[in-house]
């Protein structure tokens, strides 16, 4: 027999017993010991491992008068709500002195109807899209086989005949209900009912009919909607930023677009009220009573320029001898593009009509020839963009010059012996 | 049967490192804590501590504080212990034993003999 | 901590008298927690009584302990040669544990 005997002998009157139930059972693990001197704290183990956070509670009775008498320690585990994870091999452990102490074991099993780790979930899907749905069940009792429902009717011949975990849709064209059923020994576990809700295709190939200035006209090809027909479609439109800030994949544009609705058919619109000469993104998306489809892409465009909506502004012609000093200023309308110049016209009253390109320069000297002898003569000035002429500014008489007003140094120019255009208006 | 087997003699010099192991069998390893026990030459017995061999949880006593330590290697049912910084009042012979519920040692380890010298 | 003062520390006997040898404690302990060892020359000492009146296995039975509070004591009712050793007893009332320093008991 081994030295020191007494290190062989459990304290453990009592062992925990065996647990089997259904999932969310309520059930409690007792042990017992009988202990000399002052009772010891008892650990609960599940497969070996001690519970940190166990609902125990653990009751000591003294048995004698002296604290050196034996105690009577009871300790009951509970489990509440019963979960796979709580399932295994159970027992108590006290430290008593130098040497621990386990229990025997007791077991705690599930068994009962099949459980969903994964259900069906509501979606949105295109019209004739695939798509796929999940289910997983698990007991025990394994196995569990699932059935799959399509709008309250089975898809297959029996449980675990058809789609397991996974189910393929190929395409739906109305909104449908999905649900599974898992069957095992114990009975038959319903999933929840997912609805998957069939939306209009995106549109495809959104594109420019025609350019205008201020606006655009831009068409599309409406996607399947299933038995659902489209009520409308909604263009949005935003500033490009010069190309910069929206990529084709980007959610959201960089400010507020503008939003225009479009009755349809046809699946056109005209946007309006843009700016000219503008880098623009447009996207479009199509909705029908179950709801919109996802938009397209940004589609970059442009508004081509305009001309000047407006003639140069604050003209001034002064007339010294045989020279002449015009100048003016921007015009205070919009150009609609980049300003590439300015034309100026002047005509005397017997003479006719002399046409220059001045340039960006926004003041001019002009030779005159006959040294002062063309009477009433008048200067027109209008600016000019790639997209052609403004409007004209009214005819300017050149005023003789005082001594006292500024007239700076400017290059001159001759004036051509023919007239280079002529206006119908004059 | 039971046995706790130590490592062999050591000669050390002092401000060395000494680790001795206390290799056991026959029992649950982590059922019974080990106690080390020194012994100076024509001395008594002196305890230095315990490890609880479930837990891994060393216990020292106040003269072993500081350059001793505890530790276990559970899979090979070993203990060990490390004495660091050694000086010549370590020279002794170290038991390692196990310990019961009633703080008794019942089984001893053969000893191991520390000679310390410069 | 619980210093225990053993006494004689060196006693001397002839084969077949009975001797008792003593272990005071500084403060009381259970009787469950004092222990004898036997230590042998060159030896590793061994359990030889627990919670002071039980024989280790293997221990003759002309070996006795008894004892509470803070006095304990050893006896042997009829010494042999082979009883030659040191006997150390041995405390826990809290850490650290602590052994007494030795009672040494010759056989003539």
């Known amino acids: 027999a081994p030295r020191g005997t007494q290190a062989e002998e459990s304290p453990f009157v009592g062992n925990p017993g065996n647990i089997t139930g259904a999932r969310g059972l309520t059930g409690t693990l007792r042990c017992q010991l009988q202990v000399q001197g002052e009772p010891p704290e008892v650990h609960w183990l599940r497969d070996g491992q001690i519970l940190e956070l166990a609902d125990s509670t653990q009751t000591q009775v003294p048995l004698g008068e002296d604290e050196q008498d034996d105690w009577i320690v009871v300790s009951q585990l509970r489990i509440t709500s019963l979960q796979l994870s709580d399932t295994g091999q159970y027992q108590c452990l006290v430290f008593l002195g130098h040497q621990t102490f386990v229990s025997q074991p007791g077991y705690v099993g599930l068994e009962g109807l099949p459980y969903f780790l994964e259900e069906p979930e509501d979606r949105t899907v295109a019209a004739n899209t695939p798509f796929n749905l999940s289910c997983q069940a698990q007991g025990p009792p394994e196995p569990v086989d699932l059935l799959w429902l399509q709008d309250a009717v089975p898809l297959a011949t029996a449980p675990g005949h058809g789609p397991q975990r996974s189910l393929h849709v190929p395409g739906l064209n109305k909104t449908s209900s999905f649900s599974c059923e898992a069957h095992n020994a114990k009975g038959v576990t319903t999933s929840r009912t997912a609805t998957i809700t069939v939306l209009p295709q995106q549109p495809r190939n959104l594109h420019l009919v025609s350019r205008q200035p201020t606006e655009l006209e831009v068409a599309w090809t409406p996607g399947l909607s299933g038995i659902y027909p489209l009520t409308h479609c909604t263009l949005q439109a935003v500033l490009s930023d010069d190309g910069m800030g929206i990529q084709a994949g980007e959610p959201d544009p960089p400010e507020e677009p503008l939003t225009s609705q479009a009755s349809v058919p046809p699946h056109q619109l005209r946007l309006g009220s843009l700016h000219p000469h503008t880098p623009y993104h447009i996207r479009v998306a199509c909705t029908s009573s179950q709801g919109p489809s996802s938009w397209t892409h940004w589609l970059p465009v442009e508004t081509p320029e305009g001309v000047p909506l407006g003639p140069p502004e604050n003209i001034s012609a002064t007339r010294n001898g045989s020279q002449a000093f015009v100048h003016w200023q921007e015009p205070r309308a919009p150009l609609q593009g980049t300003l590439l110049g300015y034309r100026l016209a002047y005509q005397g009253q017997d003479t006719p009509e002399v046409l220059m390109d001045i340039g960006l320069r926004q003041e001019v000297t002009l030779e005159l020839q006959g040294d002062g002898s063309v009477s009433n003569l008048t200067v027109c000035v209008a600016a000019y963009t790639a997209a052609g002429d403004g409007p004209w500014s009214l005819p300017v008489p050149l005023e003789a010059w005082r001594p006292g007003q500024a007239q700076p140094v400017h290059q001159l120019v001759k004036e051509p012996s023919t007239p280079a255009f002529s206006w119908p208006w004059w | 049967q039971i046995q706790l087997v130590q490592s062999g003699p050591e000669l050390k010099k002092p401000g060395e490192t000494v680790k001795i192991s206390c290799k056991t069998s026959g029992y649950t390893f982590t059922y019974y804590g080990i106690n080390w026990v020194k012994q100076a030459p024509g001395k008594g017995l002196e305890w230095m501590g315990w490890?609880?061999?479930?837990?891994?949880?060393?216990t020292y006593a106040d003269d072993f504080k500081g350059r001793f330590a505890f530790s276990l290697e559970t899979s090979a049912s070993t203990a060990y212990l490390q004495i660091n910084n050694l000086r010549d009042e370590d020279m002794a012979t170290y038991f390692c034993?196990?310990?019961?519920?009633?703080?008794?040692?019942?089984?001893w380890g053969q000893g191991t003999a520390l000679t310390v010298s410069s | 901590q619980n210093v225990l003062t053993q006494s004689p520390a060196i006693m001397s006997a002839s084969p077949g008298e009975e001797v008792t040898m003593t272990c005071r404690a500084s403060s009381s302990v259970s009787s469950s927690y004092l222990h004898w060892y036997q230590q042998k020359s060159g030896a590793s000492p061994k359990l030889w009584i627990y919670?002071?009146?039980k024989l280790a296995s293997g221990v003759p039975a002309r070996f006795s302990g008894s004892g509470s509070g803070t006095s304990y004591s050893l006896t042997i009712s009829s010494v042999e040669a082979e009883d030659a050793a040191t006997y150390y007893c041995?405390?826990?009332?809290?850490?650290?544990?602590?052994f007494g320093s030795g009672t040494k008991l010759e056989v003539k």
């Open positions: 034993t196990r310990g019961t519920m009633s703080y008794s040692f019942d089984y």
């Open positions: 041995h405390q826990y009332s809290g850490d650290p544990l602590t």
């Open positions: 490890i609880n061999t479930y837990l891994g949880e060393p």
């Open positions: 919670s002071t009146s």
